[in-house]
């Protein structure tokens, strides 16, 4: 059995109340594909949502989050409060990262500092709430005889001043 509605173009619907002729989507509705028997209601960007793209007869509205919030989920289905760097969002609001953790973004959770010793390296720059530690070369890299891009400076004997 052939679908008599299959050729109704996007932006229209196949109107069963009018003998299956194509009718335009009513205001505030859309159909993004052809052959639809109904049009979908346009998404409304209200409250913490703001409109990024208006609804048209062939495509849904697209939302963003207002300032101080960021999108979560497919097609920005939720807005979550921003926090400062060095914080994470909890049920009680934004909280500072615990010692030994950091967050360098306005969203997400605090993550543990890198454990430099796991890679046999030393801590070159200490971590903060906002930044991870910076690992330096391993102690072995600093020992005499280790290959290096620049040769080590010659050792001076005690009591001798530079020439």
């Amino acid at each position: 059995l052939q679908d008599l509605c299959s050729n109704c173009p996007a932006g229209t619907f196949c109107d069963n109340n009018r003998s299956q002729i194509c009718s335009p989507c009513p205001p505030n509705s859309f159909s993004s594909a052809g052959g639809q028997r109904t049009c979908d209601i346009c998404r409304q960007c209200k409250g913490v949502f703001k409109t990024r793209k208006e609804c048209s007869s062939t495509s849904n509205a697209e939302c963003d989050c207002i300032s101080g919030y960021h999108c979560l989920g497919a097609e920005c289905s939720m807005c979550e409060q921003d926090c400062k760097q060095g914080q994470e969002l909890t049920k009680k609001g934004c909280k500072d990262c615990c010692f030994g953790t950091f967050n360098d973004q306005k969203r997400g959770i605090c993550r543990p500092w890198t454990n430099c010793s796991l890679d046999g390296k030393s801590v070159l720059v200490n971590g903060t709430k906002e930044r991870d530690v910076v690992c330096g070369p391993s102690p072995a890299d600093l020992s005499p005889g280790a290959s290096s891009a620049t040769p080590p400076a010659p050792a001076r004997e005690p009591g001798h001043s530079p020439q």
């Epitope: 052939q2 050729n7 109704c8 173009p9 003998s19 002729i21 194509c22």
Partner: nanobody
């Protein structure tokens, strides 16, 4: 409500030409397919030509090359240009609003009243 009104029929000599018009109202013309049909005395109604919203056309073998269907969306009108007319073209000619913008295996949702071609 949906209305379709044919005009342009009349008496014509063999080999002559006629242009039929079908003015429509009561629906969104530009997004729907339209068709032309005819019914000769004592015969079944016969499909002649159809045109969809994208101006794709389909013709019956009996009229292909002689008849041309076209549409003017600004005027909400569909036309049938008939050339090299023959005595067997005598019939009442009807325009039809087709279901679902289909020109392949079309099905008519609404008919006009018809215009006589002799």
């Amino acid at each position: 409500q949906v209305q379709l009104q044919e005009s342009g029929g009349g008496l014509v000599q063999p080999g002559g030409s006629l242009r039929l018009s079908c003015a429509v109202s009561g629906f969104s013309f530009s997004i729907n397919a339209m068709g032309w049909y005819r019914q000769a005395p004592g015969k079944r109604r016969e499909f002649l030509a159809a045109i969809d919203s994208g101006r794709n056309t389909v013709y019956a073998v009996s009229v292909k090359g002689r008849f041309t269907i076209s549409r003017d969306n600004a005027k909400n009108t569909v036309y049938l240009q008939m050339n090299s007319l023959k005595p067997e073209d005598t019939a009442i000619y009807y325009c039809g609003l087709l279901k679902g913008n289909r020109v392949v295996s079309p099905s008519v949702a609404y008919w006009g009243q018809g215009t006589q071609v002799t």
